[in-house]
Amino acid sequence: KSPIFGPEEVNSVEGNSVSITCYYPPTSVNRHTRKYWCRQGARGGCITLISSEGYVSSKYAGRANLTNFPENGTFVVNIAQLSQDDSGRYKCGLGINSRGLSFDVSLEVSQGPGLLNDTKVYTVDLGRTVTINCPFKTENAQKRKSLYKQIGLYPVLVIDSSGYVNPNYTGRIRLDIQGTGQLLFSVVINQLRLSDAGQYLCQAGDDSNSNKKNADLQVLKPEPELVYEDLRGSVTFHCALGPEVANVAKFLCRQSSGENCDVVVNTLGKRAPAFEGRILLNPQDKDGSFSVVITGLRKEDAGRYLCGAHSDGQLQEGSPIQAWQLFVNEESTIPRSPTVVKGVAGGSVAVLCPYNRKESKSIKYWCLWEGAQNGRCPLLVDSEGWVKAQYEGRLSLLEEPGNGTFTVILNQLTSRDAGFYWCLTNGDTLWRTTVEIKIIEGEPNLKVPGNVTAVLGETLKVPCHFPCKFSSYEKYWCKWNNTGCQALPSQDEGPSKAFVNCDENSRLVSLTLNLVTRADEGWYWCGVKQGHFYGETAAVYVAVEERKAAGSRDVSLAKADAAPDEKVLDSGFREIENKAIQDPRLFAEEKAVADTRDQADGSRASVDSGSSEEQGGSSR
């Protein structure tokens, strides 16, 4: 017997859609082999109608698709605009039609639900509004108008012109009688529920001369859109519920058991703890549409998601909704990278950010996730030479090591730097990743003086003390600027005396600036690296002043200024503007990144955690 499984019988009506799921054992071979849907002929052959290799028969053009979900061992055939001609026997299968693994499916399409003559059919989405129009003749103009719902064999009054409203419809129904010129009354039902579906009868008058009109109301639940994303990657749910709910609270929820739907995020400020640091709900447009971005996808994020609108900010009967089924592919193209990076106050972190290696020329960004309101992610740095003002001298985005990974270095850490940060590019929006920076107890490993003053025309020597743990690392000095950190020559001065219990492997490496000029003023970093992988860094600000007394300056650790945790950067800058990034491509709105950089002096940066993989500040 075949290991393929699916529905043996599918029954539907003309004009409807069906979604046929076929289940197969998810072996490596099965996951990658051809999937097909074919129609069995009278002589025993099976004519392919659609396959996973892109073939679509002319009979199915524009109305069918086949989607494979290898992680789940399923593929789904969606067929829309059914007609009675689609009735027949089919196979869903793997491999070659004639000798592949398959399952027989019988599809029967009938003419549609039995409707009374002169029945008007209203097909409306769940949560939306329907207007049932009821014509009448002049003799009934002054008589009672009413709408009944057929329940079993009996009509039940829903609303009438004397003011009665059935309790099931309270607060969401009204009866409008048009002006004297029009012989028509309307019943408007909003926040439609699935239970509202059925046969209705509207009536003008109560005697044998009354006017009657039949209506069939079909309330459609949303078919879930199938979404398939990579583990550690990102997903964007675009939710367009229509202008009529533009001012109603919006939500995204995840279905659990039954009809329970746990709020993931809503516009009332609620956010599920599991999504802290890795979710953004973008501001809604005037038409009520909005998007939710989730990064750092985890296996447990898979499931059914609904977005909707309701004043409570959660799913209620009558909420207009959209649905998605999210599958998380564990055979991810997105490499593992640490989701937690630890640093100490005054120290540094080096964060590795993956990107799609096919997009090496894309612009890279690093932004801070902020949880206030619906979440935002102000940019801190990009690969085109822009650094947010208060991060000057302590933040750098490097294209190294390249080939699918870039590096972000942040030093002079304070407790305020703890939080979630996002790595992203202006290319593939699925490659948004998150990292959490944690500030832990401890001392920085590299020791440098605090602030240093050099004298014009003289020589300045700045020391950097490296403990023995970095004996095998390359040690360097560089001058920081917006585009990176340009390497400078340095001298190995032998073992350092700055460390207790540290042997000859510790090192004192000095930066020497000869004949200091005004151009030498700025931030200098000393650091360690192994090849193209960066470790810890320490920063020193060199100020340049006029000569007061002759001689060269040799700065020692004893002359260091205030503790790094007390350093206040750019405190004199006025706040220019406060734009949070809702792009680059964060919400696929293709806004120019230059217009959305956060230049506010007051905002800080962050990113997100996915699993418990961790990385110390100096590890690769």
């Epitope: 699935l194 239970s195 279905q255 039954g258």
Partner: nanobody
Framework: QVQLVESGGGLVQAGGSLRLSCAAS????????MGWFRQAPGKEREFVAA??????????YYADSVKGRFTISRENAKNTVSLQMNSLKPEDTAVYYC????????????????????WGQGTLVTVSS
């Protein structure tokens, strides 16, 4: 809370027929899934048949062991699902459980017990040889 009540079980001779019914309390499910599972003495509970629906579309699923002998159907107005069992065999002897999932969105593999939110108490079917 939805409650499921099974009926129709009993003793029947091999080759005979029985019709099991499962009634769901509460409002009608406008979309969802109901299924039948069975558990023979000393064995694990196994899938028998299921029916999923949404609007005017229904999907019927059967285990290989009952294909061609059992038929699942649903009566919308009464919120009931029936299992017509023909050509019964002694190996069909088991407690038959009704299960349901009430959802806005169709679920996963109908053979999986975790796909159902509500379960009945079960009805015993005994097929004598």
């Amino acid at each position: 809370q939805v409650q499921l009540v099974e009926s129709g079980g009993g003793l029947v001779q091999a080759g005979g027929s029985l019709r099991l019914s499962c009634a769901a309390s509460g409002r009608a499910f406008s979309s969802g899934r109901m299924g039948w599972f069975r558990q023979a003495p000393g064995k694990e509970r196994e899938f028998v048949a299921a029916i999923s629906w949404s609007g005017h579309t229904t999907y019927k699923y059967y285990a290989d062991s009952v294909k061609g002998r059992f038929t699942i159907s649903r009566e919308n107005a009464k919120n009931t699902v029936s299992l017509q069992m023909n050509s019964l065999k002694p190996e069909d002897t088991a407690v038959y459980y009704c299960a349901a999932r009430q959802s806005l969105v169709a679920g996963g593999d109908p053979r999986g017990q975790s796909e159902y939110d509500y379960w009945g108490q079960g009805t015993l079917v005994t097929v004598s040889s």
